[in-house]
């Protein structure tokens, strides 16, 4: 479903998008993800903030927690205990990094309608969760882990060595949170709550990034974060498991690291419980082309965890790094030893494999010149996954079901023909035993969320269809969008073009390239969006193009691993190649071409502007990386190796933005960065600016005081207003 465009009788009432529309979020959409609490029940927060329980089978619903109770502690979030006795209420949310935040927690007793008094939780808490069965609580406070058998009980302290910026228990340090897990937590309950596993990160030897936070005080604060840049000392990780029934009996037991991993620097990448007495850990060498999956069993006699070599499965890449963006996680089957996992097949496409004894004997479940993307659920007789197989569009996502109970296994696309025009990009959320599931369609039409029967796939009801948005868009001249591909030198370049509403191929239009281009990313996706570039096409008459070049994901390893150890070369070349092809199409004004990007996109846009091609009149880099020596070890080394003479130092040096300062002389360059960017440090832009000044090259710049990598809040409005002015000036468009 795309809202009707301009060819109607009410053409005179149609209006273009305004920048204000975008900044106000006028055309934002809603999704509906049920908070499943059983096979047939889910919770949802109603518009008036009551927490409502829905029973699919009866079609009935009732409130279990009133908005008055929520409001009494200013709660912004909640969590029901699995035994349905208690709810935690979360308030005083205070953001830290991408996923992490601290909050105050209150426990409400649903049986008697009162808050639990006595042995209240300390504040602020870094992470809190219920056990999967009953109502035990695990939480992290001041980098230490605590356990409560019941909400009203006194806590049992599990760890004692937690120290700010030094030792992290149950929560990740900065680099593990952003680049490895990536979550705000690093503790995992066993399926029935018998054991609690947790990670300990030791950051004592990691160099610290320090930056000023100006605030309102007379003297700025200094923010210090242990942050390993490429080649620096990394966190040291250990995994422990404790019996939560008798936590004081033997205390936390360390899980051994596989010998082939422990022989040099390594990472822990994920933990998956299989049963209460079997756990699966994934490890990765610092040189991230070897991953080991280790299945460990509890030994009752020794009260220890045993990880036999026979239960170690090695995943290695000879052409790039292990995995896609991350090494995939296993999904175990009911026999509690075999599992399903996505990794590259012999043809270099990521597919689902079934591993029973060794990786060498893995049975390939999916195959083809497309990729399996996520395994959602494995039941006794079905496996649900997403892929971009349908009609060979890599930027789509459909949900498939493979019957694993029958032979040969049969495959069915659950979503391909549901709302074909409106919906080509799905995700799913399953209830216990996949009895029911919700489908969330992100586009290309207006997003819609629906509820389905897990056995028949029948649609039961619409959960959210964004009717208000549909109505609001009825009198808006939205741009046209097309997704197509270019074939260049045996490389397929998929692109999305956003065209002005009254686009005429015989006319000439200014072109803006929006680029991200990071390894294992995808920008050309069949999703709905009304955003800044929609406005630029709708109101300002620009053509905007997004191109997925070498290094991008879901089209096979040849394209993905092309950038291995060579960041900043092919990503840029492919943007330039695409621009040349767009010029050949005849409707681009080649004197008015710009490029812009954020983060990795800021790096690519900067290098494209400094490529010396003369193609670009101007461009913008927001929070760019400028040298890979400045970015995080885990991310950078995955793709670039180490910045040492005997490894890849030469390309680290060759691929900086600063090395091309001279080439910015003939372009208009706008450089933007937040001074409190914990991720891509302000240092990156400071060094670009210094190099441009030293080369006596004129440029424009904007900093955002105390803003991080997201440039949120009022900065967002200022940012997009500023960039709009810059582009309109570049393209000689009147204000």
């Amino acid at each position: 479903l795309r809202p009707s465009r301009v060819h109607n009788s009410e053409e005179n009432t149609m209006r273009a998008l305004t920048l204000k529309d975008i900044l106000n979020g006028t055309f934002s959409y809603k999704t509906f993800f049920p908070n499943w609490i059983s096979g047939q029940e889910y919770l949802h927060q109603s518009a008036d903030n009551n927490i409502v329980l829905y029973n699919i089978e009866t079609g009935q619903s009732y409130t279990i927690l009133s908005n008055r109770t929520m409001k009494s502690v200013n709660a912004s979030n909640y969590g029901l205990s699995p035994d349905r006795q208690f709810v935690y209420l979360e308030s005083d949310y205070s953001k830290l990094w991408r996923y992490s935040y601290t909050a105050t927690y209150y426990i409400y007793d649903l049986s008697n309608g009162e808050f639990v008094r006595g042995n209240e939780l300390p504040r602020p808490i870094q992470y809190l969760c219920w056990s999967p069965v009953g109502s035990k609580l695990a939480y992290v406070y001041q980098n230490n882990i605590y356990l409560k058998q019941r909400p009203g009980d006194p806590p049992f302290q599990i760890t004692f060595n937690g120290r700010e910026n030094k030792i992290f228990n149950g929560i990740p340090d900065w680099v593990y949170e952003e680049e490895m897990l990536p979550t705000k937590y690093a503790l995992w309950w066993s399926p029935n709550g018998k054991f609690l596993a947790y990670a300990e990160f030791n950051d004592k030897d990691i160099p610290v990034i320090a930056y000023s936070y100006y605030g309102d005080e007379q003297y700025p604060r200094t923010i210090n974060i242990p942050y390993p840049k490429a080649g620096a000392k990394n966190p040291v990780v250990r995994i422990f498991i404790i019996d939560t029934t008798y936590p004081a009996y033997v205390g936390p037991q360390e899980v051994p690291v596989p010998a082939m991993i422990a022989s040099s620097d390594y990472y822990f990448s994920w933990l998956t419980w299989v049963t209460d007495e079997r756990v699966c850990l994934q490890w990765l060498k610092r040189v991230q082309n070897v991953s080991v999956l280790s299945i460990c069993d509890f030994r009752e006699d020794w009260q220890t965890w045993d990880c036999p070599k026979t239960q170690e499965h090695i995943e290695e890449s000879r052409t790039g790094w292990a995995g896609g963006f991350f090494v995939s996680r296993p999904v175990f089957s009911y026999d509690a030893i075999s599992y399903y996992k996505i990794f590259s097949d012999k043809d270099g496409y990521k597919h689902i494999h079934y591993i029973k004894d060794t990786v060498e004997n893995a049975i390939q479940i999916t195959s083809g010149k497309w990729e399996a993307i996520n395994i959602f659920r494995v039941t006794q007789d079905s496996l649900f996954y997403s892929s971009n197989e349908f009609e060979e569009y890599p930027g789509r996502r459909n949900i498939y079901r493979i019957s694993i109970g029958s032979y040969p296994p049969s495959k069915k696309c659950v979503t391909c023909h549901l709302r074909k025009e409106r919906c080509q990009y799905y995700t799913a959320s399953f209830s216990d035993y996949a009895k029911y599931y919700a489908l969330v369609c992100y586009g290309p039409g207006i997003p819609i969320s629906t509820l389905h029967d897990g056995r028949t796939d029948q649609e039961i009801k619409i959960l959210e269809e964004n009717k208000e948005l549909e109505n609001a868009l009825k009198n808006i001249q939205l741009p046209k969008e097309e997704i197509k591909k270019l074939e260049v030198d045996e490389i397929t370049l998929w692109y999305k073009m956003i065209l002005p509403p009254q686009f005429d191929r015989s006319k000439k239009y200014p072109l803006l390239i929006q680029v991200y281009g990071g390894p294992c990313s995808q920008s050309v996706r069949s999703v709905f969006a009304v955003n800044w570039i929609s406005y630029l096409a709708s109101k300002e008459g620009m053509v905007i193009a997004l191109v997925d070049g070498r290094g991008t994901a879901f089209q096979g390893d040849k394209l993905l691993y092309a950038v291995y150890r060579k960041l900043g070369v092919y990503e840029v070349e492919d943007q330039i190649t695409a621009v040349r092809k767009f010029i050949e199409m005849g409707f681009i004004d080649e004197k008015r071409i710009a490029i812009w990007g954020w983060s990795y996109g800021g790096y690519v846009s900067s290098l494209a502007l400094a490529s010396g091609t003369g193609l670009f009149k101007c461009g913008i880099a927001v929070a760019p990386v400028s040298s890979w020596e400045y970015y995080a070890s885990v991310y950078t080394e995955r793709f670039m190796g180490l910045p040492t003479k005997d490894d890849n130092l030469e390309h680290y040096k060759n691929s900086t933005v600063m090395a091309r300062a001279e080439y910015f002389r003939n372009v208009d360059y706008l450089l933007i960065h937040g001074t409190a960017d914990d991720n891509v440090h302000f240092q990156n832009s400071a060094q670009i600016a210094k190099a441009l000044v030293n080369a006596q090259v004129d440029f424009q710049a904007m900093w955002y005081s105390d803003q991080n990598h997201g440039l949120s809040g009022l900065s967002t409005n200022h940012l997009y207003t500023h960039m709009t002015h810059f582009l309109k000036q570049c393209f000689s468009l009147s204000d």
Epitope: N55, T58, Q60, T63, I64, R84
Partner: nanobody, 116 residues
Framework: QVQLQESGGGLVQAGGSLRLSCAAS????????MGWYRQAPGKQRELVAG???????KYVESVKGRFTISRDNAKNTVHLQMNSLKVEDTAVYYC??????????WGQGTQVTVSS
Amino acid sequence: QVQLQESGGGLVQAGGSLRLSCAASGTMSSINAMGWYRQAPGKQRELVAGILSDGTTKYVESVKGRFTISRDNAKNTVHLQMNSLKVEDTAVYYCNFFPPPVPASWGQGTQVTVSS
């Protein structure tokens, strides 16, 4: 609005057994998740056991292995079989949805007294 009527309580010696029943009537079908709750003198009401519409059961630690919750959807009833009763099981027992709705309407309950 749903009406819930508990029955089956009584006086029993420690180690003895009782079977409580709850009859549900009204607009909300008993196929919803149902629970047994209890309130001892001077204490707050607490959950004892719950049963989901698919038959999945949940028990608090103190009654595991002694109490069994079951349901008869055809008759709109939920039962609580209580074996090996202890003095500390003495309380008024109530049934309700699991978890209870807001605002919760509780029935009269049924008194269970366990003597030593």
